[in-house]
């Protein structure tokens, strides 16, 4: 025997209170598949979330994050504050990367400059808060009298980062 509810299309629900008639989803609810016994409540994009796609009777709302925040999690279930390049997010807000560390993203944490000397190379371009050092040829490969532009970067061991 076929389930009478299976004929209820997306956007409706099988209303047990009305002899299993297919009733339209109430406002602010949806059903994305046929044969549903109830409609699901639409997601509300509030606070740091903003509406990317409005809810319809057949599909849920989609949210993203307001400017200055980035999405985390499935379907942008979380929003985390952005920082500038050269910074990392702490509980006290965005803090500059400590000397010897950098962050080239608006999210995430600072990490130490590459230690060129570990690969037998020299520093070609100094690191900054926003950029890693650029390693060049090994000191032995440089022409006589030439030297690297700076002393080797500190070892890639985390230093003390700001709280």
């Amino acid at each position: 025997l076929q389930d009478p509810c299976s004929k209820c299309p997306a956007g409706t629900f099988c209303d047990n209170n009305r002899n299993q008639i297919c009733s339209p989803c109430p406002p602010n609810s949806f059903s994305s598949t046929s044969g549903q016994k109830a409609c699901d409540i639409c997601r509300q994009c509030e606070g740091v979330f903003r509406t990317k796609k409005v809810c319809s009777s057949t599909s849920n709302a989609e949210c993203d994050c307001t400017p200055g925040f980035h999405c985390l999690g499935a379907g942008c279930s979380m929003c985390e504050q952005d920082c500038k390049q050269g910074q990392e997010l702490t509980k006290k807000g965005c803090k500059d990367c400590c000397f010897g560390t950098f962050n080239d993203q608006k999210r995430g944490i600072c990490r130490p400059w590459t230690n060129c000397s570990l690969d037998g190379k020299s520093v070609l371009v100094n690191g900054t808060k926003e950029r890693d050092v650029v390693c060049g040829p090994s000191p032995a490969d440089l022409s006589p009298g030439a030297s690297s532009v700076t002393p080797p970067a500190p070892a890639r061991e985390p230093g003390h980062s700001p709280q």
Partner: antibody
């Protein structure tokens, strides 16, 4: 959609080596940290360490430093956890997770059994 | 490194409020996050950055964090909330993540 897919269960003998993997898809793998988390049978979660696949910078929990090696190959969007000599006490479920503080996506876990 | 201490178990009657604590030296100076893990499944974030609830997580879940204690509160606990709960924090001293020992929540 974002996914982290881990390699299958492993049964090993003490002293053997092992490398398990975690393949990311649906996002810019190079620019998000990947962490590894251990869960021994019936026990809690333990953070082992993390890697930034963009430049393979790693950072370990003091408890796991020198015990395991974390690596990544950004060209195939895959992170690895490896042991050079397994012990019976390494028997556990190992999860990879995206992030360093908030772990928003997790792999399905790789069960590693070490027994003679 | 900071150590996070949780009660091994908490029991609550359905519909009542469950509170799970997470103690650690000055944890209030760092963000605390909470994960729910059900048997055979990977953990899921239920609270992030002390008090924020991901979409899809019921409103009955809330969090707070100050001083030496972070707290996960589940108001009107339901049978489906029975799980293990873990607090965690990222510490900028040592650049490490630490998990609490976990709390098994039993709904009586």
């Amino acid at each position: 959609q974002v996914q982290l897919v881990q390699s299958g269960a492993e049964v090993k003998k003490p002293g053997e080596s092992l490398k398990i993997s975690c393949k990311g898809s649906g996002y810019s793998f190079s620019t998000y940290w990947i962490s590894w988390v251990r869960q021994m049978p019936g026990k809690g979660l333990e953070w082992m360490g993390k890697i930034y696949p963009g430049d393979s910078y790693t950072n370990y929990s003091p408890s796991f430093q020198g015990q395991v090696t974390i690596s990544a190959d950004k060209s195939i969007s895959t992170a690895y956890l490896q042991w050079s000599s397994l012990k019976a006490s390494d028997t556990a479920m190992y999860y990879c997770a995206r992030g360093y503080g908030i772990f928003d996506y997790w792999g399905q876990g790789t069960l590693v059994t070490v027994s003679s | 490194d900071i150590e996070l201490t949780q009660p091994p178990s908490v029991s609550v009657a359905p519909g009542q409020t469950a509170r799970i604590s997470c103690s650690g030296d000055n944890i209030g100076d760092q963000y605390a996050h909470w994960y729910q893990q059900k048997p055979g499944q990977a953990p899921v974030v239920v609270i992030y950055q002390d008090k924020n609830r991901p979409s899809g997580i019921p409103e009955r879940f809330s969090g707070s964090n100050s001083g030496n204690t972070a707290t996960l509160t589940i108001s009107g606990t339901q049978a489906e909330d029975e799980a293990d709960y873990y607090c965690s924090t990222y510490t900028f001293v040592g650049f490490t993540t630490v998990f609490g020992g976990g709390t098994k929540l039993t709904v009586l």
